[in-house]
């Protein structure tokens, strides 16, 4: 089941999928002056059985001008763009995408792919949110949203994280920062958000993203 | 369920400062950041400040600045909030709210400034 | 700081009406918008947030849309429990501002 809407936005921060779920659709987009070859695919899908997820399709792009190359054209400067990256705050261990059962990794470029890509999330899809260059988060509840099912329609969970430009916040004497509660979330939670030791994990395989491309276009 | 218990009434002289507390339960505390907010009567709705309940980092409004404490204890699951050298303007009820978008209140605690 | 100003500031509508509220910010706030409803003696409660995302338990004859500097909360047929009054907020940067209110009573 496709995910009605995108993820939510948080301001002053950037989301990204560390891995896919079996089913997510990647557009086959082309950067300016070029186009998807004749009889290519629209789409990147993944897919996979109990063992194995991977992408089906390929996507190519030849030049719009001449018919049958995939010769790279000079691009005019707006397509010049550089794709943002964000610096995560402290280094941790990897954590293989691939270990994830049902999921895909992030496809591989293909040549002349447009600078955004365009995915479609499937229900059970989840997201991972940073503050961007020059903010920093005020508070880092969960940072993630999952795409669920609720009364046969898709939602996404929001996000508790705030990220503030402000330098100078106040905190309180005599307290130190708490660690994440150990408690689990009572019933009347679960439904809506993910366990404590998933938070925890995708930390780890966020925080493994030195310089991470978040330019990326989900819908 | 998720609930948010604040404190009872208040009465209090100017100059003097009340301590507001709410109590969340029902969920997972740390996880949502504690917002203040004020309704003076038959006014609307105006934001205090926002507190870290994992951090204990907090960002005050301008106007409250240098008269208001935020503070949390994550051993009770409890946010406060301490106004000082209140006048007859600071009469109104206090709400905490939680998370980003707001999506439980408290009940509200009526402050009372009056000599 | 941004300013969020509603429209109208009140208005009487009758049950089975479809009424239209509106919130505009002084700067583009994309889409980090919530509108809430509160009754007299009463805390504000949730309707909308992130611009048009209803609630949960939120009746669907509410719905929200807008994105930038103008955002409509519509009541697609007005019901008795719908009086109270009704603001919106910006969750784009401190500080956090609330609209002034608009005031909808049932005729």
């Known amino acids: 089941e496709l995910c009605d809407d995108d993820p939510p936005e948080i301001p002053h921060a950037t989301f990204k999928a560390m891995a896919y779920k079996e089913g997510t659709m990647l557009n086959c987009e082309c950067k300016r002056g070029f186009r998807r070859i004749k009889s290519g695919s629209l789409y990147m899908l993944c897919t996979g059985n109990s063992s194995h997820s991977s992408w089906d399709n390929q996507c190519q792009c030849t030049s719009s001008a001449t018919r049958n190359t995939t010769k790279q054209v000079t691009p005019q400067p707006e397509e010049q763009k550089e794709r943002k990256t964000t610096e995560m705050q402290s280094p941790m261990q990897p954590v293989d995408q691939a270990s994830l059962p049902g999921h895909c990794r992030e496809p591989p470029p293909w040549e002349n792919e447009a600078t955004e890509r365009i995915y479609h999330f499937v229900v059970g899809q989840m997201v991972y949110y940073q503050c961007v260059q020059g903010y920093r988060a005020l508070h880092r509840g969960p940072a993630e949203s999952v795409c669920k099912m609720t009364h046969g329609k898709t939602r996404w969970t929001q996000p508790q994280l705030i990220c503030t430009g402000e330098m100078e916040t106040s905190q309180f004497p005599g307290e130190e920062k708490p660690q994440a509660s150990p408690e689990g979330r009572p019933e009347s939670e679960t439904s809506c958000l993910v366990t404590t030791t998933d938070f925890q994990i995708q930390t780890e395989m966020a925080a493994t993203m030195e310089t991470s491309i978040f330019t990326t276009e989900y819908q | 369920q998720v609930q948010l218990v604040q404190s009872g009434a208040e009465v209090k002289k100017p100059g003097a400062s009340v301590k507001v507390s709410c109590k969340g339960s029902g969920y997972t505390f740390t996880d949502y950041a504690m917002h203040w907010v004020r309704q003076a009567p038959g006014q609307g709705l105006e934001w205090m400040g926002v507190i870290s309940t994992y951090s204990g980092d907090a960002i005050y409004a301008q106007k409250f600045q240098g008269r208001v404490t935020m503070t949390v204890d994550t051993s009770t699951s409890t946010a406060y909030m301490e106004l000082s050298s209140l006048r007859s303007e600071d009469t109104a009820v206090y709400y905490c709210?939680?998370?980003?978008?707001?999506?439980?209140w408290g009940q509200g605690t009526t402050v009372t400034v009056s000599s | 700081d941004i300013q969020m100003t509603q429209s109208p500031s009140s208005l009487s509508a009758s049950v089975g009406d479809r009424v239209t509220i509106t919130c505009r910010a002084s700067q583009d706030i994309s889409n980090y918008l919530e509108w809430y409803q509160q009754k007299p003696g009463k805390a504000p409660k949730l309707l909308v947030y992130?611009?048009?995302t209803l609630a949960e338990g939120v009746p669907s004859r509410f719905s929200g849309s807008g994105s930038g500097t103008d955002f409509t909360l519509t009541i697609s047929s007005l019901q008795p429990e719908d009086f109270g009054t009704y603001y919106c907020?910006?969750?784009?940067?401190?500080?956090?501002?609330f609209g002034q209110g608009t005031k909808l009573e049932i005729k």
């Open positions: 907020q910006h969750h784009y940067d401190t500080p956090y501002t």
């Open positions: 709210a939680r998370g980003v978008t707001f999506d439980y």
């Open positions: 992130n611009a048009k």
